[in-house]
């Protein structure tokens, strides 16, 4: 978990801080959204359960050329124990519904905030 705070992290980041930083970034995305996020790109919906971070990254990494979510993609890579590349779907067990990136971010944010409030940081 050493890279979760971005490139300037001085050392290991506590899991609670890493999760908080991810929540903050998603809040910023949703609050600063003026035009459709990522031009209305669609991504695979995910199950917000075990393996959620890798699944979220696998879904979002297929969105290219969207600077608004680049930091989120980097942060999610710190939560996912394996390397994820575009077109990889090992954690996306069910690929049957596509939703807009904006809705994906909102759903993910709600779930992460619940985990944070419950004290589930890992």
């Amino acid at each position: 978990l050493t890279c979760l705070g971005g490139f300037a992290s001085p050392g290991p980041v506590p899991p609670s801080t890493a999760l908080r930083e991810l929540i903050e970034e998603l809040v910023n995305i949703t609050q600063n959204q003026k035009a459709p996020l990522c031009n209305g790109s669609m991504v695979w919906s995910i199950n917000l359960t075990a393996g959620m971070y890798c699944a979220a990254l696998e879904s979002l990494i297929n969105v290219s050329g969207c600077s608004a979510i680049e930091k989120t993609q980097r942060m999610l890579s710190g939560f996912c124990p394996h390397k994820v590349s575009a077109g990889q779907f090992s954690s996306l067990h069910v690929r049957d519904t596509k939703i807009e990136v904006a809705q994906f971010v909102k759903d993910l944010l709600l779930h992460l905030k619940k985990l944070f409030r419950e004290g589930q940081f890992n």
Partner: antibody, heavy 123, light 107 residues
Framework: EVTLRESGPGLVKPTQTLTLTCTLY??????????VDWIRQPPGKGLEWLAH???????RYNPALKSRLTISKDTSKNQVVLKLTSVDPVDTATYYC???????????????WGQGTLVTVSS | DIQMTQSPSSLSASVGDRVTISCRAS??????LNWYQQKPGKAPKLLIF???MKPRGVPSRFSGSGSGTDYTLTISSLQPEDIATYYC?????????FGGGTKVEIK
């Protein structure tokens, strides 16, 4: 207008269970992002956070008192109840309930407080 | 638990003076620092949240600053109605913890 009102027994005997009720006005604990905290303040001393409960029934406690505390809510009455078991004279304090909101970042800032209820633990 | 240390524990200043109260956390709290004002016999009132943000109705003479472990509450021009005890509180990590308070009096 947002208001919180605490009610309690005033006097409790050592070893008994203290039950405090916080009634909420002007907002509902069934609304997303709403939470209620309990804080206490011994006479002439500082503030100590005890517990909180969120709209979706997520509960958190101060580890130092966790084994003695239970927080719950009754959405139909718009009330939050705190129980503190095995009370001791050191639990003598003014007990406050306060509202917290998590609409954006989770600040854990208490923006509205009740007037407080003084509880004395004595035989 | 994160320890919050406030200084000074009390101060006396004249009306119109600039007053600063310090709060130090035992570890980085990432700006999750809130300030409360408690007047004698009353409940605390939220003055500042997230280091520098103000709820509606808080006078402009109150401001907050800081980062990492060190935070400051400033009253730019002390008024008689500012006689109170001021508490800092960290909201970064549970359990939530408060500073010991700073009692502000008028000279």
């Amino acid at each position: 207008e947002v208001t919180l009102r605490e009610s309690g027994p005033g006097l409790v005997k050592p070893t008994q269970t203290l039950t405090l009720t916080c009634t909420l006005y002007g907002f509902s604990l069934s609304t997303s992002d709403m939470g209620v905290d309990w804080i206490r303040q011994p006479p002439g001393k500082g503030l100590e956070w005890l517990a909180h409960i969120w709209w979706d029934d997520v509960k958190r406690y101060n580890p130092a008192l966790k084994s003695r505390l239970t927080i719950s809510k009754d959405t139909s009455k718009n009330q939050v109840v705190l129980k503190l078991t095995s009370v001791d004279p050191v639990d003598t304090a003014t007990y406050y309930c306060a509202r917290t909101v998590s609409s954006g970042y989770i600040y854990y800032a208490m923006d509205y407080w009740g007037q407080g209820t003084l509880v004395t633990v004595s035989s | 638990d994160i320890q919050m240390t406030q200084s000074p524990s009390s101060l006396s200043a004249s009306v119109g003076d600039r007053v600063t109260i310090s709060c130090r956390a035992s570890q980085d709290i990432r700006n999750y620092l809130n300030w409360y004002q408690q007047k004698p016999g009353k409940a605390p009132k939220l003055l500042i949240f997230y280091t520098s943000m103000k709820p509606r109705g808080v006078p402009s003479r109150f401001s907050g600053s800081g980062s990492g472990t060190d935070y400051t509450l400033t009253i730019s021009s002390l008024q008689p109605e500012d006689i109170a005890t001021y508490y800092c509180q960290q909201g970064n990590t549970l359990p939530l913890t408060f500073g010991g308070g700073t009692k502000v009096e008028i000279k």
